[in-house]
């Protein structure tokens, strides 16, 4: 399963689309910056088996897909870019699911790292809560877009380490 290679390209495309989605100058949103507590430690460890690592990445992309699939998101971002972004994420999710199925027969370890997946879920809960508290304002969405771009970049480093392990 050549997921890390294909996923890395998909990740890059998703980052480019996210970068293009900006609607207002981020300079005007500095006071809205927020620490969402990105679960860095879940992307630092080398202890994961490949299937477990993929399941954590899958959760992050699934949660991103969910976040940008809401009606509030549709009201904020340019529709064609949002559709391309969602399609890109969906393709990555499908690739990952196929890859995990392949890996299951190869590895003895559990398919999922439950604690890591829970940490990612809680991270996205904090993002959703922030958006709610900020009433889905344009600046709040800009901050979230910047945060997701950063988390994608950090997970890209994780994927590259995963590829080197192979």
């Amino acid at each position: 399963c050549d997921l890390p290679q294909t996923h890395s390209l998909g990740n890059r495309r998703a980052l480019i689309l996210l970068a293009q989605m900006g609607r207002i100058s981020p300079f005007s949103c500095l006071k809205d910056r927020h620490d969402f507590g990105f679960p860095q430690e879940e992307f630092d460890g080398n202890q994961f088996q490949k299937a477990q690592a993929i399941s954590v990445l899958h959760e992050m992309i699934q949660q991103t897909f969910n976040l940008f699939s809401t009606k509030d998101s549709s009201a904020t971002w340019e529709q064609s870019l949002l559709e391309k972004f969602s399609t890109e994420l969906n393709q990555q999710l499908n690739d990952m699911e196929a890859c995990v199925i392949q890996e299951v027969g190869v590895e003895e370890t559990p398919l999922m790292n439950v604690d890591s997946i829970l940490a990612v879920k809680k991270y996205f809960q904090r993002i959703t809560l922030y958006l709610t508290e900020k009433k889905y304002s344009p600046c709040a969405w800009e901050v979230v877009r910047a945060e997701i771009m950063r988390s994608f970049s950090l997970s890209k480093i994780f994927q590259e380490r995963l590829r080197r392990k192979e």
Epitope: A19, G22, P26, C29, L30, A146, E147, M149, R150
Partner: antibody
Framework: EVQLVQSGAEVKKPGESLKISCKGS????????IGWVRQMPGKGLEWMGI????????RYSPSFQGQVTISADKSISTAYLQWSSLKASDTAMYYC??????????????WGQGTLVTVSS | DIQMTQSPSSLSASVGDRVTITCRAS??????LNWYQQKPGKAPKLLIY???SLQSGVPSRFSGSGSGTDFTLTISSLQPEDFATYYC?????????FGQGTKVEIK
């Protein structure tokens, strides 16, 4: 390794133009803003302005608006600070530094080594 | 623009001393405050961001506190390499502004 490497020291005459540079490496250049800071001899730090290299959106401190121009070329991961007509009072050390934009990360965590600009007749 | 005022502008201390530098903003800046150290002929170095977060690689003897308008940088036990000038900077709004600096000298 993250690095911001600035162009070398410059000696200029009043009225001359100048463009100094700051080249980023070891990170995604368009994911961080680049700020410029002036330090006149024996004085403190003065914030000049900032640029988002992803789209070249720029903001200046009122004190520097119209006095300098900040630009960037993302294709070569380089930010610039330029003057069209230098004055003796522009004599200073100029630093560039990266900023994470709206993402939650340390502000101005990496700095260039500084470019000394001397303006004298 | 938001004005940042540091005090004292300079201080003399001995190795091992506990040193406190304060920074006051002209309006509330929440916790969007950074502290930098600068040594002669060198670029500034980030010590503390978001008022109290220690930058990676910075010794734990440095700490920051405060929110709103009043902030403090503390060096719990001054070391020879800590003699330098320290600057605060607000990061909540453009233009970002620095304090005038506090020079920490050897007594």
């Amino acid at each position: 390794e993250v690095q911001l490497v600035q162009s070398g020291a410059e000696v200029k005459k009043p009225g001359e133009s100048l463009k100094i540079s700051c080249k980023g490496s070891g990170y995604s250049f368009t994911s961080y803003w680049i700020g410029w800071v002036r330090q006149m001899p024996g004085k403190g730090l003065e914030w000049m302005g900032i640029i988002d290299p992803s789209d070249s959106d720029t903001r200046y401190s009122p004190s520097f608006q119209g006095q300098v121009t900040i630009s960037a070329d993302k294709s070569i991961s380089t930010a610039y600070l330029q003057w069209s007509s230098l004055k003796a009072s522009d004599t200073a050390m100029y630093y560039c530094a990266r900023h994470p934009g709206l993402a939650w990360a340390p502000d101005f965590d990496y700095w260039g080594q500084g470019t000394l600009v001397t303006v004298s007749s | 623009d938001i004005q940042m005022t540091q005090s004292p502008s300079s201080l003399s201390a001995s190795v091992g001393d506990r040193v406190t530098i304060t920074c006051r903003a002209s309006q509330s800046i929440n916790r969007f405050l950074n502290w930098y150290q600068q040594k002669p002929g060198k670029a500034p170095k980030l010590l503390i961001y978001a008022a109290s977060s220690l930058q990676s690689g910075v010794p734990s003897r440095f700490s920051g506190s405060g929110s709103g308008t009043d902030f403090t940088l503390t060096i719990s036990s001054l070391q020879p390499e800590d003699f330098a000038t320290y600057y605060c900077q607000q990061a909540i709004d453009l233009p970002f502004t620095f304090g005038q600096g506090t020079k920490v000298e050897i007594k």
